[in-house]
């Protein structure tokens, strides 16, 4: 729909209108993760509930295989919150004793895998240094944008390292899209 | 509406549509606030501005001591950022100290209470661990995600520590809602 | 349209109805910023990547000079995420030397400019204090909310440090708008 | 080993339908996109539709929608093509194809002979 | 449908030389993809995205372009690049080849 006009919004505007109720839309919740083979030199994506508790698809937007399923071209919102959480980096031991170094990280990358490129999209990433003395350490990153997707679009959590990922609560960590 | 079917996004959908002006939606923005007591276990609620400045509530959503109000069913997008502060926290100087500690930490939850069922529902949750060293510190917690709420819903924020909250700017600590 | 009330939502609406296709929308994407003359005691606005890879600005909302127009009136949702990276913080050392400092931060703003408005209005502030030891530090800060927005009202991205602003992607540092 | 591996009569009658399945191996079909591709003799090629095999959405080529028919199955890790009323003009070698999310690979092509 | 129009159909070149083929789409388009064909093979991606060499293609290969209008270039031809190279693009719905160019050693 990208260039597309339509007549100007203080017109009517008859047809073809959409009950919202009817349109695409996913929230899903965190469950623990099996270890799964990953491609190298790319990030393991995330599985996910797809049913119980808050979790819902609805209106043809179906999770399957870590992905959710994009059933028709439009402009999603597009979310997810991943918590992290773990024991003292191993940079912060370097760094007590005096040596600076590049820190540990941990990242989340929401992917969207579409037929027409052989290379996953990026479509958001949050990506933050963690450096912490002497302590367990936990934190959130959240992202959330809009984008043009196509019928077919698969989208995907991936994190940098899926033994950090806080799996026990369903608000912690969760991953959602809904058509506008 | 999780199970619903409507008729194919191609086919004309004549009733019963909405006005996008006419859906329920509320912005809510930071104040002082006052110290109140709290169940034990739970964390406070806070309460907030819903008509001066950038806040609003709009179209049946009302606001009242400390709730937002669903005042029809439907999937609700939900976020707040609450931004805090504080003096150094207490786990870095016992960490100086080489005593490894669980840290001090801030928290948000989105809550939803319903009527009809006896403990609250945590929706969103943003916690993080604070281990500053000498210094004051600042920083904010962003939560945001899609929900299928019912009529008579009440959605409260709540924090770990009330006292940290920074209730300086309405752009800093915030709290809305809009029907889909 | 804040205190408008329309027919309850049980009723049949005619008129007028937007297909939601019609609607202003944009998702820009960071690119590297050219230093620029910015006023005294006001932080820098970024300038944006509106066309290329994930950017687009459709139906009538345009970005233009580092802002983003609003062609039409009506409630908005309004988002970014700046990725910020840099070196050891100049606190830190200070720190390390046994004294407690206001430590650096790093700040990102949403700002509304009105021509009606002589002063700009800041609509969201992530802000953050950095206090890293001995090694390179990265972190986003992410915002969005939903606002009343004005036809002929700009909207801008303002950071309290351009050079510290992670522009190498497209997924990391963004910002975007879209009418309800 | 990934390999994308098609099989089907080599020959098939005018005015019936041309079945080909593709077998994969070495790879999780449902992380990606399986098209079918033909190329007539001593012409170029042809994109005839895909489909995404987690979810089962297709898109076809609108030239041929009225015939062409992708399913799959990802229990057998299998992707068939059938392609009704066919003609001589159906004759053609005719490819599997993996596309999205990893490098495209296609198979090494099966060739169908529409002959009487 | 975008129609895919290559130039030139067949071209003759020496080994060593540089070697440039262009294709028109009919409307604009955000990616190029180039395939190299081989006789009795299957076609193997050689460019995707307008620009980005697949994985295990070597550099002489390069692409460019944007819009309508895309080149596919041969630093320096090969005696084992003799093949017919098709241009692609995925976006409208049908996926449509150029018609190929044939490409010899003089």
């Known amino acids: 729909l990208k260039g597309q006009e339509f007549a100007p919004s203080h017109q009517q505007v008859y047809a073809p209108l959409r009950a919202d109720g009817d349109k695409p839309r996913a929230h899903l919740t965190v469950v623990r993760q099996t270890p799964t083979q990953h491609l190298k030199n790319q990030f393991p994506a995330l599985h996910w509930e797809h049913e119980l508790g808050l979790a819902f698809t609805k209106n043809r937007m179906n999770y399957t295989n870590k992905f959710l399923l994009i059933p028709e071209s439009g402009d999603y919102f597009v979310y997810s919150q991943v918590t992290f959480r773990g024991m003292t980096s191993e940079c912060s031991e370097i760094r007590q004793a005096g040596r600076p170094n590049k820190p540990d990280s941990i990242t989340v990358v929401i992917t969207k895998v579409t037929d027409s490129y052989p290379e996953p999209t990026q479509l958001l990433m949050g990506t933050k240094s963690v450096c912490e003395v002497g302590s367990n350490w936990f934190q959130p990153i959240y992202l959330g944008a809009m984008f043009s997707l196509q019928e077919g679009d698969k989208l995907m959590v991936n994190v940098s390292d899926i033994s950090l990922v806080d799996y026990t609560k369903e608000d912690k960590t969760f991953f959602g899209a809904f058509l506008l | 509406l999780k199970g619903q079917e409507f008729a194919p996004s191609h086919q004309q959908v004549y009733a019963p549509l909405r006005a996008d002006g006419d859906k329920p939606r509320a912005h809510l923005t930071v104040v002082r606030q006052t110290p109140t007591q709290h169940l034990k276990n739970q964390f406070p609620a806070l309460h907030w501005e819903h008509e001066l400045g950038l806040a609003f509530t709009k179209n049946r959503m009302n606001y009242t001591n400390k709730f937002l109000l669903i005042p029809e069913s439907g999937d609700y997008f939900v976020y707040s950022q609450v931004t805090f502060r504080g003096m150094t926290s207490e786990c870095s100087e016992i960490r100086q100290a080489g005593r490894p500690n669980k840290p001090d930490s801030i928290t948000v939850v989105i809550t939803k209470v319903t009527d009809s069922y006896p403990e609250p529902t945590q929706l969103l949750m943003g916690t993080k661990s604070v281990c500053e060293v000498g210094s004051n510190w600042f920083q904010p917690i962003y939560l945001g995600a899609m929900f299928s709420l019912q009529e008579g819903d009440k959605l409260m924020v709540n924090v770990s520590d009330i006292s940290l909250v920074d209730y300086t700017k309405e752009d800093k600590t915030f709290f809305g809602a809009f029907l889909l | 349209l804040k205190g408008q009330e329309f027919a309850p939502s049980h009723q049949q609406v005619y008129a007028p109805l937007r297909a939601d296709g019609d609607k202003p929308r944009a998702h820009l994407t960071v690119v590297r910023q050219t230093p620029t003359q910015h006023l005294k005691n006001q932080f820098p606005a970024l300038h944006w990547e509106h066309e290329l890879g994930l950017a687009f600005t459709k139906n009538r909302m345009n970005y233009t000079n580092k802002f983003l127009l609003i062609p039409e009136s009506g409630d908005y949702f309004v988002y970014s995420q700046v990725t910020f990276r840099g070196m050891t913080s100049e606190c830190s050392e200070i720190r390390q030397a046994g004294r407690p400092n206001k430590p650096d931060s790093i700040t990102v703003v949403i700002t509304k400019v009105t021509d009606s408005y002589p002063e700009p209005t800041q609509l969201l502030m992530g802000t953050k204090s950095v206090c890293e030891v001995g090694s390179n530090w990265f972190q986003p800060i992410y915002l969005g909310a939903m606002f009343s927005l004005q036809e002929g009202d700009k909207l801008m991205v303002n950071v309290s440090d351009i050079s510290l602003v992670d522009y190498t992607k497209e997924d990391k540092t963004f910002f975007g708008a879209f009418l309800l | 080993q990934v390999q994308l591996q098609e099989s089907g009569p080599g020959l098939v009658r005018p005015s019936q339908t041309l079945s080909l399945t593709c077998t994969v191996s070495?790879?999780?079909?449902?992380?990606?996109?399986m098209h079918w591709v033909r190329q007539r003799p001593g012409r170029g090629l042809e994109w005839m539709g895909r489909?995404?095999?987690?979810?089962?959405?297709?898109k076809y080529n609108p030239s041929l929608k009225s015939r062409v028919t992708i399913t799959r199955d990802t229990s057998k890790n299998q992707v068939s093509l059938r392609l009704s009323s066919v003609t001589a003009a159906d004759t053609a070698v005719y490819y599997c194809?993996?596309?999205?999310?990893?490098?495209?690979?296609w198979g090494q092509g099966s060739l169908v002979t529409v002959s009487s | 449908d975008i129609q895919m129009t290559q130039s030139p159909s067949s071209l003759s070149a020496s080994v060593g030389d540089r070697v440039t083929i262009t294709c028109r789409a009919s409307?604009?388009?955000?990616?190029m993809y180039w395939y190299q064909q081989k006789p009795g093979k299957a076609p193997k991606l050689l460019i995707y995205?307008?620009?980005n060499l697949a994985s295990g293609v070597p550099s002489r290969f390069s692409g460019s372009g944007s819009g309508t209008d895309f080149t596919f270039t041969i630093s320096s031809l090969q005696p084992e690049d003799i093949a017919t190279y098709y241009c692609?693009?995925?976006?409208?719905?049908?996926?449509?080849f150029g018609q190929g160019t044939k490409v010899e050693i003089k």
């Open positions: 409307s604009s388009v955000s990616y």
């Open positions: 070495g790879f999780d079909m449902a992380d990606t996109y």
């Open positions: 489909i995404e095999p987690a979810g089962g959405h297709t």
């Open positions: 194809v993996r596309s999205g999310g990893l490098p495209d690979m």
């Open positions: 995205g307008a620009s």
């Open positions: 692609q693009q995925w976006e409208g719905n049908p996926r449509t």
